[in-house]
Amino acid sequence: CDLPQTHSLGNRRALILLAQMGRISPFSCLKDRHDFGFPQEEFDGNQFQKAQAISVLHEMIQQTFNLFSTKDSSATWEQSLLEKFSTELNQQLNDMEACVIQEVGVEETPLMNVDSILAVKKYFQRITLYLTEKKYSPCAWEVVRAEIMRSFSLSKIFQERLRRKE
């Protein structure tokens, strides 16, 4: 399963689309910056088996897909870019699911790292809560877009380490 290679390209495309989605100058949103507590430690460890690592990445992309699939998101971002972004994420999710199925027969370890997946879920809960508290304002969405771009970049480093392990 050549997921890390294909996923890395998909990740890059998703980052480019996210970068293009900006609607207002981020300079005007500095006071809205927020620490969402990105679960860095879940992307630092080398202890994961490949299937477990993929399941954590899958959760992050699934949660991103969910976040940008809401009606509030549709009201904020340019529709064609949002559709391309969602399609890109969906393709990555499908690739990952196929890859995990392949890996299951190869590895003895559990398919999922439950604690890591829970940490990612809680991270996205904090993002959703922030958006709610900020009433889905344009600046709040800009901050979230910047945060997701950063988390994608950090997970890209994780994927590259995963590829080197192979």
Epitope: L30, R150, S153
Partner: antibody, heavy 121, light 107 residues
């Protein structure tokens, strides 16, 4: 390794133009803003302005608006600070530094080594 | 623009001393405050961001506190390499502004 490497020291005459540079490496250049800071001899730090290299959106401190121009070329991961007509009072050390934009990360965590600009007749 | 005022502008201390530098903003800046150290002929170095977060690689003897308008940088036990000038900077709004600096000298 993250690095911001600035162009070398410059000696200029009043009225001359100048463009100094700051080249980023070891990170995604368009994911961080680049700020410029002036330090006149024996004085403190003065914030000049900032640029988002992803789209070249720029903001200046009122004190520097119209006095300098900040630009960037993302294709070569380089930010610039330029003057069209230098004055003796522009004599200073100029630093560039990266900023994470709206993402939650340390502000101005990496700095260039500084470019000394001397303006004298 | 938001004005940042540091005090004292300079201080003399001995190795091992506990040193406190304060920074006051002209309006509330929440916790969007950074502290930098600068040594002669060198670029500034980030010590503390978001008022109290220690930058990676910075010794734990440095700490920051405060929110709103009043902030403090503390060096719990001054070391020879800590003699330098320290600057605060607000990061909540453009233009970002620095304090005038506090020079920490050897007594």
């Amino acid at each position: 390794e993250v690095q911001l490497v600035q162009s070398g020291a410059e000696v200029k005459k009043p009225g001359e133009s100048l463009k100094i540079s700051c080249k980023g490496s070891g990170y995604s250049f368009t994911s961080y803003w680049i700020g410029w800071v002036r330090q006149m001899p024996g004085k403190g730090l003065e914030w000049m302005g900032i640029i988002d290299p992803s789209d070249s959106d720029t903001r200046y401190s009122p004190s520097f608006q119209g006095q300098v121009t900040i630009s960037a070329d993302k294709s070569i991961s380089t930010a610039y600070l330029q003057w069209s007509s230098l004055k003796a009072s522009d004599t200073a050390m100029y630093y560039c530094a990266r900023h994470p934009g709206l993402a939650w990360a340390p502000d101005f965590d990496y700095w260039g080594q500084g470019t000394l600009v001397t303006v004298s007749s | 623009d938001i004005q940042m005022t540091q005090s004292p502008s300079s201080l003399s201390a001995s190795v091992g001393d506990r040193v406190t530098i304060t920074c006051r903003a002209s309006q509330s800046i929440n916790r969007f405050l950074n502290w930098y150290q600068q040594k002669p002929g060198k670029a500034p170095k980030l010590l503390i961001y978001a008022a109290s977060s220690l930058q990676s690689g910075v010794p734990s003897r440095f700490s920051g506190s405060g929110s709103g308008t009043d902030f403090t940088l503390t060096i719990s036990s001054l070391q020879p390499e800590d003699f330098a000038t320290y600057y605060c900077q607000q990061a909540i709004d453009l233009p970002f502004t620095f304090g005038q600096g506090t020079k920490v000298e050897i007594k």
